[in-house]
């Protein structure tokens, strides 16, 4: 069209959040969607000065079609004010974002409260335990069953008898390891189940109990304690 127009913002909702507090190593994206005729150009300033590629290790990306600035793997030296300047021959507009890079302290894995939850099912039924793990460092996750040996839950050293049911391996995704499925439940499956998550800082675990009920109209089965340990 021949309607000449100074630059204007086309999506102010995307620009409302001016303060961005981002954990170190994350990717930051600032957007300044704009219009105008002729189509305006966009440039970026850091702390009021021209922002050059050599100003940061790894540089940055500008996606002109998306009116965006992208910085990958941010570090503390990336903190500051970032201003987009959008201009054509009829005018100029600008918008400033403030970036704060948060160096988060790595912590023990945090397990979501209430998970895994106690469960009950009938003999022959299916059950699942869910464990949600939050960890800065890559966690290693295990599902453990507290078992009995010779009628006792504890060995002569006072330590509990344990069986590792499931552990994260090369071919196991985090999502897969977060759920423990028990199919065709028997009375022997009753007991305490523990979701354990560890990282370089420490170990956290939550436990839940599985109660197994007799199937309707069926005599309660008598089962022996498992005599194995893994």
């Amino acid at each position: 069209s021949n309607n000449k127009r100074a630059p204007y913002w086309t999506n102010t909702e995307k620009m409302e959040k001016r303060l961005h507090a981002v954990p170190a190593a994350n990717t930051v994206k600032f957007r300044c969607p704009a219009g105008g005729n002729p189509m305006p150009t966009m440039r970026w300033l850091k702390n009021g000065k021209e922002f050059k590629q050599e100003h940061r290790i790894g540089g940055y990306k500008v996606r002109n079609q998306h009116w965006s600035l992208i910085m990958e793997s941010v570090v503390p030296s990336d903190k500051g004010n970032y201003t987009c300047v959008v201009e054509n021959e009829y005018g100029s507009i600008n918008h400033t974002y403030h970036l704060d890079v948060v160096e988060r302290s790595p912590h023990r894995p945090i397990l979501q409260a209430g998970l895994p939850a106690n469960a009950s099912t009938v003999v022959g039924g299916d059950v699942e335990f869910v464990c949600k793990v939050y960890s800065d460092a890559q966690p290693h996750i295990q599902w453990i069953k507290h078992v009995e040996k010779n009628g006792s839950k504890y060995g002569p050293d006072g330590l509990p008898y344990l069986k590792v049911l499931k552990a994260a391996g090369v071919n196991t995704t985090d999502k897969e390891i977060e759920v423990l499925y028990i199919r065709n439940v028997t009375f022997e499956d009753a007991g305490e189940y523990t979701c354990l998550a560890g990282n370089s800082i420490g170990i956290s675990f939550h436990s839940a109990w599985l109660t197994v009920l007799p199937a309707p109209g069926r005599e309660k089965e008598i089962t022996a304690s498992p005599d194995y340990l893994e």
Epitope: L111, L162, V164, S200, I201
Partner: antibody, heavy 124, light 112 residues
Framework: EVQLVESGGGVVQPGRSLRLSCAAS????????MHWVRQAPGKGLEWVAV????????YYADSVKGRFTISRDNSKNTLYLQMNSLRAEDTAVYYC?????????????????WGQGTMVTVSS | DIVMTQTPLSLSVTPGQPASISCTSS???????????VYWYVQKSGQPPQLLIY???NRFSGVPDRFSGSGSRTDFTLKISRVEAEDVGVYYC?????????FGGGTKVEIK
């Protein structure tokens, strides 16, 4: 017997480098995170760094970040601390300590076993 | 960083008498798993630290029952019910919930 033995300490000039070692025995070294902790003469304890059981995650105290590197060789049951650009304030006894294991822990999940320490003196 | 503040700086105790050391953290050490990650150590002259108490109140194996740990969230106490001559040393609290792991400044226990 579960044991950690540090070595590699000595007297070094400011700006120079030193590599400390910690030899582990009596437990499955490759299943435990490992830490370095130091103690300046007459002072308290200061945590320096940690490395995960497989070496994939490393964290450092701000005071040594960018200068010290923690590493491990699980085939040799040995933990290392490479110390570059040493300063007078790095003068301390350096201890290695066992961290969290990979599995269920009935008891403390780390800092139960410490080495005897190795003295590092940074002086011109 | 979590700051661990220990009091008193030193303590002179008559053998057989009780002793108490306090430690305060700048943030709660109560974790989502319900445990409180404060550890207590003693360091005797020329030796590395020795673990006494883990997870607030659990005595480490081989530690005499005259040592006990208590507290909640940010305020912690190590008690020695009857001090013995062998208890001489510097006592440290440590938070073990996040990096950087931090220690209290230490409390020197002496025998009168």
């Amino acid at each position: 017997e579960v044991q950690l033995v540090e070595s590699g300490g000595g007297v070094v000039q400011p700006g120079r480098s030193l590599r400390l070692s910690c030899a582990a025995s009596g437990f499955t070294f490759s299943s435990y995170a490992m830490h370095w902790v130091r103690q300046a003469p007459g002072k308290g304890l200061e945590w320096v760094a940690v490395i995960s059981y497989d070496g994939s995650n490393k964290y450092y105290a701000d005071s040594v970040k960018g200068r010290f590197t923690i590493s491990r060789d699980n085939s040799k049951n040995t933990l290392y601390l490479q110390m570059n650009s040493l300063r007078a304030e790095d003068t301390a006894v350096y201890y290695c300590a066992r961290g969290a294991g990979r599995g269920y822990t009935y008891g403390p999940d780390g800092f139960d076993i410490w080495g005897q320490g190795t003295m590092v003196t940074v002086s011109s | 960083d979590i700051v661990m503040t220990q009091t008193p700086l030193s303590l002179s105790v008559t053998p057989g008498q009780p002793a108490s050391i306090s430690c305060t953290s700048s943030r709660s050490l109560l974790h989502s798993d319900g445990k409180t990650y404060v550890y207590w150590y003693v360091q005797k002259s020329g030796q590395p630290p020795q673990l006494l108490i883990y997870e607030l109140s659990n005595r480490f194996s081989g530690v005499p029952d005259r040592f006990s740990g208590s507290g909640s969230r940010t305020d912690f106490t190590l008690k020695i019910s009857r001090v013995e001559a062998e208890d001489v040393g510097v006592y440290y609290c440590m938070q073990y919930i996040e990096a950087p792991l931090t220690f209290g400044g230490g409390t020197k226990v002496e025998i009168k």
